[in-house]
């Protein structure tokens, strides 16, 4: 297993609709054809997997149907979008990149993007 540098923004504020997008960029030492991207969330000392996708270079990322993540790739960059976020989902979202094929296997883990989520203010009741 060889180490690889992964860069991601330090801080992002999700939209009022609970959507946060950020780029995860990795310094690929070689010509990988198969890449696996995993998003981890760290909050209150616990790390949980948010979503993961394996893709072939030049192809779209495919997350599971029920995943809250979507993404696109371009060269050594992965543009990740996480949807359905609420204030309680605020936390440090860490991008993990693995170059699966061809060998050698490379692993890179970013420093994390602190995603802040603000629940929208409830609309005042209106009488009609």
């Amino acid at each position: 297993c060889k180490a690889m540098h992964v860069a991601q923004p330090a801080v992002v504020l999700a939209s009022s609709r609970g959507i946060a997008s950020f780029v995860c960029e990795y310094a690929s030492p070689g010509k990988a054809t198969e890449v696996r991207v995993t998003v981890l969330r760290q909050a209150d000392s616990q790390v949980t997997e948010v979503c993961a996708a394996t893709y072939m270079m030049g192809n779209e990322l495919t997350f599971l149907d029920d995943s809250i993540c979507t993404g696109t790739s371009s060269g050594n960059q992965v543009n990740l979008t996480i949807q359905g976020l609420r204030a309680m989902d605020t936390g440090l979202y860490i991008c993990k990149v693995e170059l699966m094929y061809p060998p050698p296997y490379y692993l890179g883990i970013g420093n994390g993007t602190q995603i802040y989520v603000i629940d929208p203010e409830p609309c005042p009741d209106s009488d009609f």
Epitope: P9, V11, L13, A43, D44, S45, T90, L92, G112, Y116
Partner: antibody, heavy 118, light 108 residues
């Protein structure tokens, strides 16, 4: 080195607007957020809101909602805070600070004194 | 919104003494994202402690932070003349970010 440099002092009349700038240098501007904090004479620190330089999304303190607008110009690595309908109790020193996520507000501007007086 | 309460309001001590400042949150601070800042007259605040207990770059080791959840403490083990200032706690675990009212440490 990493620093935030703010615009100079302002004197405004009640009802007017003020726009304070905060120029960042020494780091990748879009990777972080910029928060604005003010301090009235002899008082504590009051958080006003913040902007994510990465995507331009904003979150304002409830009491200032509708009067404050925070923006960024990524081409010049500058953040702006505009406060409208100024009142005498808006007289304060206004600070910008870099938000780093886990590492808090690590870098602060030198402050901009705004005086609202008729 | 999380409300922070600091105590005492003023702490009168002599150089060389130990200072213990308290900060209490109205609800648990996410990931213990609590910071302490020092402010001297006419100056911008300076970050001392982040993540409740980690010292910021260049901060002397006489400053230490502790606590978790809703109760946090800043300790200055031996006060130096330059430590007399106002100290603010701040939570940045969830937005809106909030500051405590401050504790003034002055010379007895």
């Amino acid at each position: 080195q990493v620093q935030l440099v703010q615009s100079g002092a302002e004197v405004k009349k009640p009802g007017a607007s003020v726009k304070v700038s905060c120029k960042a240098s020494g780091y990748t501007f879009t990777s972080y957020g910029i928060s604005w904090v003010r301090q009235a004479p002899g008082q504590g620190l009051e958080w006003m809101g913040w902007i994510s330089a990465y995507n331009g999304n904003t979150n304002y303190a409830q009491k200032l909602q509708g009067r404050v607008t925070m923006t960024t110009d990524t081409s010049t690595s500058t953040a702006y805070m505009e406060l409208r309908s100024l009142r005498s109790d808006d007289t304060a020193v206004y600070y910008c600070a870099r938000i780093t996520g886990p590492y808090a507000f690590d870098i602060w501007g030198q402050g901009t004194k705004v005086t609202v007086s008729s | 919104e999380i409300v922070l309460t600091q105590s005492p309001g003023t702490l009168s001590l002599s150089p060389g003494e130990r200072a213990t400042l308290s900060c209490r949150a109205s609800q648990s601070v996410s990931s213990n994202y609590l910071a302490w800042y020092q402010q001297k007259p006419g100056q911008a605040p300076r970050l001392l402690i982040y993540g409740a207990s980690s010292r910021a770059t260049g901060i002397p080791d006489r400053f230490s932070g502790s606590g978790s959840g809703t109760d946090f403490t800043l300790t200055i083990s031996r006060l130096e003349p330059e430590d007399f200032a106002v100290y603010y706690c701040q939570q940045y675990g969830s937005s809106p970010f909030t500051f405590g009212p401050g504790t003034k440490v002055d010379i007895k």
